[in-house]
Protein backbone atom coordinates (compact mmCIF):
# COMPACT_ATOMS: atom_id res chain seq x y z
CA UNK A 1 0.00 0.00 0.00
CA UNK A 2 1.40 3.62 -0.97
CA UNK A 3 1.68 6.15 1.50
CA UNK A 4 1.69 9.65 0.69
CA UNK A 5 2.38 12.86 3.00
CA UNK A 6 -0.56 15.23 3.16
CA UNK A 7 0.42 18.76 3.47
CA UNK A 8 -2.09 22.08 2.97
CA UNK A 9 -0.32 23.52 -0.22
CA UNK A 10 -1.05 27.28 0.96
CA UNK A 11 -0.74 28.54 5.35
CA UNK A 12 -1.24 31.97 5.99
CA UNK A 13 0.37 32.84 9.33
CA UNK A 14 0.00 36.65 11.22
CA UNK A 15 3.03 38.22 11.17
CA UNK A 16 4.29 38.18 14.97
CA UNK A 17 1.71 35.62 15.29
CA UNK A 18 1.88 31.39 15.53
CA UNK A 19 1.47 29.46 12.73
CA UNK A 20 1.03 25.78 12.43
CA UNK A 21 2.34 23.75 9.01
CA UNK A 22 0.68 20.32 9.64
CA UNK A 23 2.28 17.09 7.57
CA UNK A 24 0.68 13.58 8.25
CA UNK A 25 2.18 10.48 6.87
CA UNK A 26 -1.16 8.49 5.59
CA UNK A 27 -2.37 5.83 5.74
CA UNK A 28 -1.10 4.47 8.50
CA UNK A 29 0.46 0.92 7.40
CA UNK A 30 0.91 -1.91 9.76
CA UNK A 31 4.93 -2.36 9.72
CA UNK A 32 5.96 1.17 8.00
CA UNK A 33 9.02 2.56 9.75
CA UNK A 34 9.59 6.44 10.08
CA UNK A 35 13.43 6.90 10.58
CA UNK A 36 13.17 10.65 10.20
CA UNK A 37 11.35 13.20 9.62
CA UNK A 38 12.87 16.44 8.70
CA UNK A 39 11.51 20.07 7.56
CA UNK A 40 13.47 21.51 4.90
CA UNK A 41 13.19 25.30 2.99
CA UNK A 42 14.87 24.59 -0.28
CA UNK A 43 14.92 28.10 -1.67
CA UNK A 44 16.56 28.90 1.26
CA UNK A 45 20.66 29.22 0.92
CA UNK A 46 22.23 26.41 1.51
CA UNK A 47 23.67 26.83 5.04
CA UNK A 48 19.34 27.63 5.89
CA UNK A 49 17.63 24.92 4.11
CA UNK A 50 17.78 22.37 6.91
CA UNK A 51 15.20 23.80 9.33
CA UNK A 52 14.12 21.34 11.47
CA UNK A 53 14.54 17.52 12.26
CA UNK A 54 12.88 14.79 14.42
CA UNK A 55 14.99 11.61 15.01
CA UNK A 56 12.95 9.05 17.37
CA UNK A 57 15.93 8.75 19.58
CA UNK A 58 16.91 11.68 19.73
CA UNK A 59 14.27 13.58 19.33
CA UNK A 60 14.23 17.38 17.63
CA UNK A 61 16.90 19.25 16.20
CA UNK A 62 16.69 22.59 14.61
CA UNK A 63 19.90 23.41 13.10
CA UNK A 64 19.36 26.54 11.43
CA UNK A 65 19.41 30.24 12.99
CA UNK A 66 16.01 31.49 11.00
CA UNK A 67 14.07 30.08 12.18
CA UNK A 68 16.28 28.69 14.66
CA UNK A 69 15.08 26.50 17.57
CA UNK A 70 13.24 29.21 20.20
CA UNK A 71 11.01 29.61 17.47
CA UNK A 72 10.00 26.41 16.31
CA UNK A 73 8.41 22.88 17.91
CA UNK A 74 6.90 20.07 16.75
CA UNK A 75 3.16 19.86 17.58
CA UNK A 76 2.67 16.39 18.04
CA UNK A 77 5.65 14.47 17.08
CA UNK A 78 7.48 12.50 20.12
CA UNK A 79 10.34 10.37 21.11
CA UNK A 80 10.78 6.62 22.30
CA UNK A 81 10.47 7.63 26.22
CA UNK A 82 12.49 5.09 26.92
CA UNK A 83 13.56 1.87 24.74
CA UNK A 84 10.22 -0.14 24.89
CA UNK A 85 8.49 2.72 23.19
CA UNK A 86 8.22 3.42 20.07
CA UNK A 87 8.33 6.71 18.40
CA UNK A 88 5.22 8.50 16.99
CA UNK A 89 6.40 10.12 13.82
CA UNK A 90 3.26 10.31 11.42
CA UNK A 91 2.09 13.76 12.64
CA UNK A 92 5.31 15.96 11.87
CA UNK A 93 3.35 19.01 12.14
CA UNK A 94 5.91 22.03 13.03
CA UNK A 95 4.40 25.16 14.72
CA UNK A 96 6.46 28.44 13.93
CA UNK A 97 6.73 31.21 16.77
CA UNK A 98 7.11 34.81 16.43
CA UNK A 99 6.50 34.78 12.25
CA UNK A 100 8.73 37.57 10.44
CA UNK A 101 8.62 38.24 6.72
CA UNK A 102 11.96 36.05 6.30
CA UNK A 103 9.78 33.21 7.48
CA UNK A 104 7.83 33.26 4.12
CA UNK A 105 8.08 30.75 1.71
CA UNK A 106 8.36 26.91 0.39
CA UNK A 107 8.72 24.51 3.18
CA UNK A 108 9.29 20.26 2.43
CA UNK A 109 8.02 17.89 5.27
CA UNK A 110 9.41 14.79 4.26
CA UNK A 111 9.02 11.27 6.09
CA UNK A 112 12.06 8.59 5.57
CA UNK A 113 10.57 5.57 5.69
CA UNK A 114 11.24 2.10 5.50
CA UNK A 115 10.39 -0.11 3.72
CA UNK A 116 8.77 2.50 1.65
CA UNK A 117 11.88 5.36 1.36
CA UNK A 118 11.22 8.80 1.35
CA UNK A 119 8.07 10.74 1.08
CA UNK A 120 7.45 14.25 0.64
CA UNK A 121 5.10 17.27 0.51
CA UNK A 122 5.38 21.15 0.52
CA UNK A 123 3.64 23.63 1.50
CA UNK A 124 4.19 27.37 1.04
CA UNK A 125 3.87 29.55 3.95
CA UNK A 126 2.49 33.35 3.61
CA UNK A 127 3.24 36.03 6.04
CA UNK A 128 0.47 38.43 6.27
CA UNK A 129 -0.14 41.62 8.39
CA UNK A 130 -3.32 42.99 9.49
CA UNK A 131 -3.01 46.70 8.43
CA UNK A 132 -4.70 49.04 10.78
CA UNK A 133 -6.84 51.61 9.07
CA UNK A 134 -7.94 55.21 9.92
CA UNK A 135 -9.75 58.26 7.58
CA UNK A 136 -9.92 61.76 7.83
CA UNK A 137 -11.00 64.90 6.31
CA UNK A 138 -8.65 67.07 5.79
CA UNK A 139 -9.81 71.13 6.48
CA UNK A 140 -9.76 72.46 3.06
CA UNK A 141 -10.85 76.29 1.71
CA UNK A 142 -12.70 76.84 -1.75
CA UNK A 143 -10.58 76.64 -4.73
CA UNK A 144 -10.74 76.05 -8.36
CA UNK A 145 -7.89 73.73 -8.09
CA UNK A 146 -8.37 69.82 -7.01
CA UNK A 147 -7.25 69.52 -3.75
CA UNK A 148 -7.03 66.80 -1.30
CA UNK A 149 -10.42 67.02 1.47
CA UNK A 150 -9.66 63.68 2.62
CA UNK A 151 -7.15 61.04 3.59
CA UNK A 152 -7.40 57.32 4.01
CA UNK A 153 -4.57 55.43 5.43
CA UNK A 154 -4.11 51.41 5.92
CA UNK A 155 -1.24 51.17 8.41
CA UNK A 156 1.58 47.87 7.73
CA UNK A 157 -0.37 45.54 5.56
CA UNK A 158 1.35 43.06 3.83
CA UNK A 159 0.44 42.79 0.80
CA UNK A 160 -0.76 46.11 0.79
CA UNK A 161 -4.59 46.86 1.09
CA UNK A 162 -6.61 47.81 -1.53
CA UNK A 163 -8.03 51.18 -1.00
CA UNK A 164 -11.24 53.04 -2.93
CA UNK A 165 -13.95 55.16 -2.15
CA UNK A 166 -17.53 55.40 -2.28
CA UNK A 167 -18.85 58.96 -2.70
CA UNK A 168 -21.69 60.72 -5.89
CA UNK A 169 -19.25 63.23 -5.97
CA UNK A 170 -17.38 64.13 -9.00
CA UNK A 171 -13.69 62.93 -7.22
CA UNK A 172 -10.36 60.95 -8.15
CA UNK A 173 -7.77 59.32 -5.96
CA UNK A 174 -4.56 59.77 -5.91
CA UNK A 175 -2.73 56.71 -4.24
CA UNK A 176 0.54 56.03 -2.63
CA UNK A 177 2.62 52.92 -0.92
CA UNK A 178 5.54 53.30 1.76
CA UNK A 179 7.31 50.70 3.60
CA UNK A 180 5.74 49.83 6.72
CA UNK A 181 7.78 50.34 10.59
CA UNK A 182 7.52 47.18 10.40
CA UNK A 183 9.62 44.95 7.81
CA UNK A 184 8.24 43.50 5.20
CA UNK A 185 4.75 45.71 5.38
CA UNK A 186 3.43 47.92 3.46
CA UNK A 187 1.02 51.79 4.54
CA UNK A 188 -1.41 52.60 2.30
CA UNK A 189 -2.70 56.37 1.37
CA UNK A 190 -5.43 56.90 -0.47
CA UNK A 191 -6.09 60.48 -1.12
CA UNK A 192 -9.58 62.07 -2.15
CA UNK A 193 -9.19 64.67 -4.46
CA UNK A 194 -12.07 67.31 -6.30
CA UNK A 195 -12.52 71.05 -6.71
CA UNK A 196 -13.58 72.10 -3.26
CA UNK A 197 -16.68 73.77 -3.09
CA UNK A 198 -20.09 74.68 -1.25
CA UNK A 199 -21.66 71.49 -2.41
CA UNK A 200 -19.35 69.19 -0.99
CA UNK A 201 -19.33 70.78 2.77
CA UNK A 202 -20.52 68.34 5.27
CA UNK A 203 -21.12 65.44 2.24
CA UNK A 204 -20.16 61.85 4.01
CA UNK A 205 -17.97 59.73 1.62
CA UNK A 206 -16.63 56.62 2.40
CA UNK A 207 -13.29 54.71 2.30
CA UNK A 208 -13.22 51.03 1.63
CA UNK A 209 -10.59 49.48 2.51
CA UNK A 210 -9.74 45.43 1.59
CA UNK A 211 -7.21 43.46 2.76
CA UNK A 212 -7.27 39.23 2.71
CA UNK A 213 -7.31 39.15 6.43
CA UNK A 214 -10.16 41.14 6.86
CA UNK A 215 -13.36 38.94 6.93
CA UNK A 216 -15.09 41.57 5.21
CA UNK A 217 -14.12 45.30 3.85
CA UNK A 218 -13.56 47.59 6.40
CA UNK A 219 -16.12 51.19 5.78
CA UNK A 220 -14.65 54.46 7.60
CA UNK A 221 -17.01 56.91 7.02
CA UNK A 222 -15.85 60.68 6.45
CA UNK A 223 -17.25 64.20 6.70
CA UNK A 224 -16.30 66.41 4.77
CA UNK A 225 -14.78 70.18 5.49
CA UNK A 226 -14.77 72.70 3.14
CA UNK A 227 -14.04 76.18 3.96
CA UNK A 228 -15.96 78.99 1.71
CA UNK A 229 -17.61 81.95 1.01
CA UNK A 230 -20.99 82.61 2.27
CA UNK A 231 -23.66 81.44 -0.22
CA UNK A 232 -27.02 83.51 0.16
CA UNK A 233 -30.31 83.58 -1.12
CA UNK A 234 -33.31 86.08 0.19
CA UNK A 235 -36.68 84.59 1.23
CA UNK A 236 -39.62 86.29 2.11
CA UNK A 237 -40.65 88.10 -0.73
CA UNK A 238 -44.76 86.92 -1.53
CA UNK A 239 -45.13 89.46 -5.13
CA UNK A 240 -47.68 91.31 -3.09
CA UNK A 241 -46.08 94.25 -1.07
CA UNK A 242 -48.82 96.90 -1.48
CA UNK A 243 -48.49 100.63 0.01
CA UNK A 244 -48.97 100.34 3.77
CA UNK A 245 -48.55 96.93 4.57
CA UNK A 246 -47.21 96.06 8.01
CA UNK A 247 -46.34 92.40 8.00
CA UNK A 248 -43.71 92.10 5.63
CA UNK A 249 -40.23 90.44 6.13
CA UNK A 250 -36.99 90.14 4.41
CA UNK A 251 -34.64 86.54 5.55
CA UNK A 252 -31.38 86.36 4.02
CA UNK A 253 -30.47 82.58 4.05
CA UNK A 254 -26.71 81.65 4.03
CA UNK A 255 -25.12 78.56 3.75
CA UNK A 256 -21.31 79.12 4.86
CA UNK A 257 -18.04 77.61 6.29
CA UNK A 258 -17.12 78.96 8.53
CA UNK A 259 -20.30 80.96 10.48
CA UNK A 260 -21.00 84.32 8.91
CA UNK A 261 -19.74 87.03 10.84
CA UNK A 262 -21.74 90.03 9.30
CA UNK A 263 -25.20 90.65 7.79
CA UNK A 264 -25.77 93.83 5.57
CA UNK A 265 -28.48 95.31 4.27
CA UNK A 266 -28.56 98.09 1.47
CA UNK A 267 -30.46 98.52 -1.55
CA UNK A 268 -29.17 99.50 -5.06
CA UNK A 269 -30.67 102.34 -5.59
CA UNK A 270 -28.25 103.89 -2.75
CA UNK A 271 -31.80 105.23 -0.54
CA UNK A 272 -32.21 102.78 2.12
CA UNK A 273 -36.32 103.26 3.68
CA UNK A 274 -36.58 104.61 6.94
CA UNK A 275 -39.28 101.88 7.76
CA UNK A 276 -36.89 99.24 7.05
CA UNK A 277 -35.22 97.81 10.17
CA UNK A 278 -31.75 95.56 9.61
CA UNK A 279 -31.83 92.80 12.26
CA UNK A 280 -29.01 90.82 11.90
CA UNK A 281 -30.10 88.20 9.10
CA UNK A 282 -33.72 89.54 8.69
CA UNK A 283 -35.14 92.86 7.48
CA UNK A 284 -38.24 93.84 8.96
CA UNK A 285 -40.51 95.87 7.36
CA UNK A 286 -43.06 98.41 9.99
CA UNK A 287 -44.94 100.05 6.93
CA UNK A 288 -44.49 99.10 3.14
CA UNK A 289 -44.13 103.04 1.19
CA UNK A 290 -43.17 103.87 -2.34
CA UNK A 291 -39.38 103.68 -1.45
CA UNK A 292 -39.76 99.87 -0.99
CA UNK A 293 -39.81 99.91 -5.26
CA UNK A 294 -36.47 99.15 -5.48
CA UNK A 295 -33.75 95.77 -5.14
CA UNK A 296 -32.48 95.32 -1.64
CA UNK A 297 -29.15 93.24 -1.38
CA UNK A 298 -28.09 91.35 1.29
CA UNK A 299 -24.45 90.79 1.81
CA UNK A 300 -22.59 88.22 4.35
CA UNK A 301 -19.17 87.82 5.67
CA UNK A 302 -17.28 84.81 7.28
CA UNK A 303 -13.81 84.36 7.32
CA UNK A 304 -13.06 83.00 4.27
CA UNK A 305 -15.10 85.71 1.95
CA UNK A 306 -18.38 87.44 1.25
CA UNK A 307 -21.16 86.59 -0.70
CA UNK A 308 -24.51 88.77 -2.03
CA UNK A 309 -28.05 88.00 -3.14
CA UNK A 310 -30.47 90.52 -4.97
CA UNK A 311 -34.62 90.58 -4.43
CA UNK A 312 -36.39 93.08 -6.59
CA UNK A 313 -39.66 94.44 -5.02
CA UNK A 314 -42.47 95.79 -6.97
CA UNK A 315 -44.93 97.45 -4.57
CA UNK A 316 -48.68 97.48 -5.87
CA UNK A 317 -51.41 99.96 -5.00
CA UNK A 318 -53.86 97.79 -3.36
CA UNK A 319 -53.64 93.77 -2.38
CA UNK A 320 -53.14 91.47 -5.05
CA UNK A 321 -56.03 88.65 -4.06
CA UNK A 322 -55.15 86.27 -6.81
CA UNK A 323 -53.36 84.32 -4.19
CA UNK A 324 -49.66 85.07 -5.29
CA UNK A 325 -47.17 82.38 -3.61
CA UNK A 326 -43.79 83.29 -2.42
CA UNK A 327 -41.06 83.41 -4.38
CA UNK A 328 -37.30 83.66 -3.09
CA UNK A 329 -34.43 85.82 -4.62
CA UNK B 1 18.58 -1.35 27.44
CA UNK B 2 18.54 -2.71 24.17
CA UNK B 3 20.85 -5.75 23.33
CA UNK B 4 21.26 -7.52 19.91
CA UNK B 5 23.50 -10.48 20.84
CA UNK B 6 24.08 -12.90 17.77
CA UNK B 7 25.21 -16.83 17.25
CA UNK B 8 28.61 -17.72 17.45
CA UNK B 9 30.74 -18.11 14.49
CA UNK B 10 30.34 -19.95 11.34
CA UNK B 11 32.62 -22.29 8.69
CA UNK B 12 30.82 -23.49 6.34
CA UNK B 13 31.22 -25.47 2.87
CA UNK B 14 29.82 -24.09 -0.77
CA UNK B 15 26.65 -24.63 -2.03
CA UNK B 16 25.84 -25.03 1.67
CA UNK B 17 23.65 -22.47 3.88
CA UNK B 18 24.40 -20.93 6.91
CA UNK B 19 21.64 -19.57 9.89
CA UNK B 20 22.64 -16.95 11.74
CA UNK B 21 20.23 -16.04 14.76
CA UNK B 22 19.90 -12.30 16.91
CA UNK B 23 18.32 -12.32 20.13
CA UNK B 24 16.69 -9.10 21.41
CA UNK B 25 16.34 -7.73 24.47
CA UNK B 26 15.78 -4.30 25.85
CA UNK B 27 12.93 -3.30 23.64
CA UNK B 28 9.06 -4.32 21.90
CA UNK B 29 10.51 -6.61 19.54
CA UNK B 30 7.57 -6.41 17.27
CA UNK B 31 7.61 -2.78 16.63
CA UNK B 32 11.08 -2.30 14.69
CA UNK B 33 12.50 -3.80 12.06
CA UNK B 34 15.90 -6.10 12.76
CA UNK B 35 18.00 -5.14 9.68
CA UNK B 36 21.04 -7.49 8.57
CA UNK B 37 24.18 -6.04 7.06
CA UNK B 38 27.50 -7.73 6.03
CA UNK B 39 30.86 -6.91 5.69
CA UNK B 40 33.03 -8.83 3.92
CA UNK B 41 36.98 -8.90 5.22
CA UNK B 42 38.92 -5.33 4.86
CA UNK B 43 35.65 -3.85 2.29
CA UNK B 44 32.59 -1.99 3.35
CA UNK B 45 28.97 -2.61 4.41
CA UNK B 46 26.00 -4.32 2.57
CA UNK B 47 22.53 -4.16 3.30
CA UNK B 48 21.12 -7.42 2.99
CA UNK B 49 17.41 -7.06 3.94
CA UNK B 50 14.90 -6.88 6.87
CA UNK B 51 11.99 -8.22 9.07
CA UNK B 52 9.24 -6.73 10.76
CA UNK B 53 8.26 -9.04 13.62
CA UNK B 54 5.00 -7.50 14.22
CA UNK B 55 3.81 -9.13 11.61
CA UNK B 56 6.63 -11.35 9.74
CA UNK B 57 6.94 -8.68 6.47
CA UNK B 58 10.26 -9.01 5.22
CA UNK B 59 12.41 -7.30 2.93
CA UNK B 60 15.34 -8.16 1.11
CA UNK B 61 18.41 -6.36 -1.28
CA UNK B 62 17.44 -7.90 -4.76
CA UNK B 63 21.06 -9.02 -5.12
CA UNK B 64 20.11 -11.74 -2.51
CA UNK B 65 16.93 -12.50 -3.22
CA UNK B 66 16.10 -16.09 -3.46
CA UNK B 67 19.05 -17.01 -1.55
CA UNK B 68 18.10 -15.25 1.68
CA UNK B 69 15.66 -15.76 4.36
CA UNK B 70 14.94 -13.18 7.22
CA UNK B 71 12.63 -14.77 9.75
CA UNK B 72 11.68 -13.64 13.50
CA UNK B 73 9.79 -15.60 15.97
CA UNK B 74 8.04 -13.18 18.72
CA UNK B 75 7.95 -15.86 21.68
CA UNK B 76 11.99 -15.68 21.44
CA UNK B 77 12.47 -12.15 20.05
CA UNK B 78 14.69 -13.88 18.02
CA UNK B 79 15.50 -13.13 14.66
CA UNK B 80 17.16 -15.22 11.87
CA UNK B 81 19.49 -14.62 8.79
CA UNK B 82 19.52 -17.89 6.37
CA UNK B 83 21.87 -17.92 3.72
CA UNK B 84 21.63 -20.65 1.40
CA UNK B 85 24.03 -21.60 -1.75
CA UNK B 86 26.80 -19.97 0.13
CA UNK B 87 29.72 -19.11 -2.06
CA UNK B 88 33.19 -17.86 -1.05
CA UNK B 89 32.40 -14.50 -1.73
CA UNK B 90 29.82 -14.72 1.77
CA UNK B 91 32.76 -14.71 3.34
CA UNK B 92 31.99 -11.63 5.80
CA UNK B 93 30.97 -10.54 9.45
CA UNK B 94 27.01 -10.57 9.40
CA UNK B 95 25.71 -7.40 11.61
CA UNK B 96 21.63 -7.69 12.92
CA UNK B 97 21.37 -3.99 13.54
CA UNK B 98 17.87 -2.35 14.87
CA UNK B 99 16.82 1.09 12.77
CA UNK B 100 15.90 3.55 15.14
CA UNK B 101 16.59 6.97 12.74
CA UNK B 102 19.77 4.94 11.67
CA UNK B 103 20.91 1.63 12.40
CA UNK B 104 21.63 2.60 15.90
CA UNK B 105 21.85 -0.34 17.69
CA UNK B 106 24.14 -3.38 16.47
CA UNK B 107 24.95 -7.09 17.09
CA UNK B 108 28.26 -7.90 17.85
CA UNK B 109 28.57 -9.57 14.16
CA UNK B 110 28.82 -13.02 13.45
CA UNK B 111 31.80 -14.45 11.39
CA UNK B 112 30.64 -16.33 8.48
CA UNK B 113 33.65 -18.35 6.22
CA UNK B 114 32.80 -19.96 3.47
CA UNK B 115 35.79 -22.71 2.39
CA UNK B 116 36.45 -25.93 0.83
CA UNK C 1 20.01 0.34 -6.76
CA UNK C 2 21.23 3.76 -5.88
CA UNK C 3 25.31 4.09 -5.60
CA UNK C 4 27.23 6.26 -3.06
CA UNK C 5 30.72 6.79 -4.14
CA UNK C 6 33.25 7.76 -1.73
CA UNK C 7 36.51 9.39 -2.21
CA UNK C 8 39.30 9.45 -1.16
CA UNK C 9 39.56 5.54 -0.21
CA UNK C 10 42.40 6.01 2.20
CA UNK C 11 43.32 9.51 3.39
CA UNK C 12 46.18 10.11 5.74
CA UNK C 13 46.25 13.35 7.67
CA UNK C 14 48.36 15.22 10.82
CA UNK C 15 46.63 15.64 13.88
CA UNK C 16 44.48 19.36 14.13
CA UNK C 17 44.08 19.12 10.25
CA UNK C 18 41.00 19.77 8.47
CA UNK C 19 39.55 16.66 6.91
CA UNK C 20 36.98 16.60 4.29
CA UNK C 21 35.28 12.99 2.87
CA UNK C 22 32.89 13.36 -0.15
CA UNK C 23 29.81 11.20 -0.93
CA UNK C 24 28.08 11.71 -4.17
CA UNK C 25 24.89 9.37 -5.04
CA UNK C 26 24.13 8.54 -8.10
CA UNK C 27 20.85 9.98 -8.23
CA UNK C 28 19.21 12.45 -5.96
CA UNK C 29 18.80 11.37 -2.42
CA UNK C 30 17.48 14.56 -0.63
CA UNK C 31 19.00 15.09 2.55
CA UNK C 32 18.58 11.20 2.95
CA UNK C 33 22.53 10.58 4.35
CA UNK C 34 24.19 8.99 7.43
CA UNK C 35 27.71 8.91 8.70
CA UNK C 36 28.96 6.48 10.50
CA UNK C 37 32.63 6.00 11.74
CA UNK C 38 33.76 2.23 12.21
CA UNK C 39 36.59 1.32 14.03
CA UNK C 40 38.89 -2.49 14.08
CA UNK C 41 36.55 -5.31 15.90
CA UNK C 42 33.46 -2.81 16.27
CA UNK C 43 30.12 -2.43 14.36
CA UNK C 44 29.60 0.99 12.88
CA UNK C 45 28.22 4.26 14.92
CA UNK C 46 26.25 7.13 13.60
CA UNK C 47 28.13 10.44 13.68
CA UNK C 48 25.35 12.34 11.04
CA UNK C 49 21.70 11.70 10.13
CA UNK C 50 19.98 13.69 7.65
CA UNK C 51 22.49 14.76 6.14
CA UNK C 52 23.55 17.79 8.47
CA UNK C 53 22.36 16.51 11.93
CA UNK C 54 24.64 15.62 14.73
CA UNK C 55 24.08 12.47 16.27
CA UNK C 56 24.15 12.89 20.14
CA UNK C 57 27.19 12.82 21.80
CA UNK C 58 28.92 13.06 18.79
CA UNK C 59 31.73 16.01 19.28
CA UNK C 60 31.12 19.18 17.40
CA UNK C 61 34.44 18.68 15.33
CA UNK C 62 32.72 16.68 13.01
CA UNK C 63 30.00 18.30 10.51
CA UNK C 64 28.10 16.74 7.74
CA UNK C 65 26.58 19.36 4.57
CA UNK C 66 25.01 18.53 1.20
CA UNK C 67 22.02 17.45 -0.37
CA UNK C 68 20.57 16.32 -3.17
CA UNK C 69 23.72 13.81 -4.82
CA UNK C 70 26.91 15.20 -3.17
CA UNK C 71 28.03 15.26 0.66
CA UNK C 72 30.89 16.15 2.65
CA UNK C 73 31.87 14.86 6.52
CA UNK C 74 34.31 17.17 7.87
CA UNK C 75 36.38 16.86 10.61
CA UNK C 76 37.66 19.82 11.89
CA UNK C 77 40.47 19.30 14.02
CA UNK C 78 41.73 15.88 13.58
CA UNK C 79 42.32 14.09 16.67
CA UNK C 80 44.07 10.53 17.33
CA UNK C 81 41.07 8.79 18.12
CA UNK C 82 39.60 9.84 14.24
CA UNK C 83 41.80 6.51 13.20
CA UNK C 84 38.65 4.73 11.59
CA UNK C 85 36.68 4.26 8.12
CA UNK C 86 33.91 6.01 7.60
CA UNK C 87 30.90 5.32 5.84
CA UNK C 88 27.88 6.91 4.15
CA UNK C 89 24.61 5.48 3.66
CA UNK C 90 21.41 6.43 1.81
CA UNK C 91 18.02 6.07 3.14
CA UNK C 92 16.14 7.41 0.44
CA UNK C 93 15.17 4.51 -1.53
CA UNK C 94 15.20 1.08 -0.90
CA UNK C 95 17.64 -0.92 -0.82
CA UNK C 96 19.73 0.69 1.47
CA UNK C 97 23.44 1.66 0.38
CA UNK C 98 26.70 2.75 1.75
CA UNK C 99 29.74 3.89 0.26
CA UNK C 100 32.61 1.96 -0.22
CA UNK C 101 34.31 3.61 2.91
CA UNK C 102 36.81 5.74 3.79
CA UNK C 103 40.45 4.65 5.64
CA UNK C 104 41.48 7.62 7.96
CA UNK C 105 44.79 7.01 9.01
CA UNK C 106 47.13 9.25 11.22
CA UNK C 107 50.69 10.62 9.81
Known amino acids: QDVRVQVLPEVRGQLGGTVELPCHLLPPVPGLYISLVTWQRPDAPANHQNVAAFHPKMGPSFPSPKPGSERLSFVSAKQSTGQDTEAELQDATLALHGLTVEDEGNYTCEFATFPKGSVRGMTWLRVIAKPKNQAEAQKVTFSQDPTTVALCISKEGRPPARISWLSSLDWEAKETQVSGTLAGTVTVTSRFTLVPSGRADGVTVTCKVEHESFEEPALIPVTLSVRYPPEVSISGYDDNWYLGRTDATLSCDVRSNPEPTGYDWSTTSGTFPTSAVAQGSQLVIHAVDSLFNTTFVCTVTNAVGMGRAEQVIFVRETPNTAGAGATGG | QVQLVQSGAEVKKPGSSVKVSCKAS????????IHWVRQPPGKGLEWIGA????????NYNQKFQGRVTITAVTSTSTAYMELSSLRSEDTAVYYC?????????WGQGTTVTVSS | DIQMTQSPSTLSASVGDRVTITCRAS??????VVWYQQKPGQPPKTLIY???YRYSGVPDRFSGSGSGTDFTLTISSLQAEDVAVYYC?????????FGQGTKLEIK
Open chain 2, 51 to 58: VYPGNSDS
Open chain 3, 89 to 97: QQYNTNPFT
Open chain 2, 26 to 33: GYIFTSYW
Open chain 3, 27 to 32: QNVGIN
Open chain 3, 50 to 52: SAS
Open chain 2, 97 to 105: TKLVGTFDY
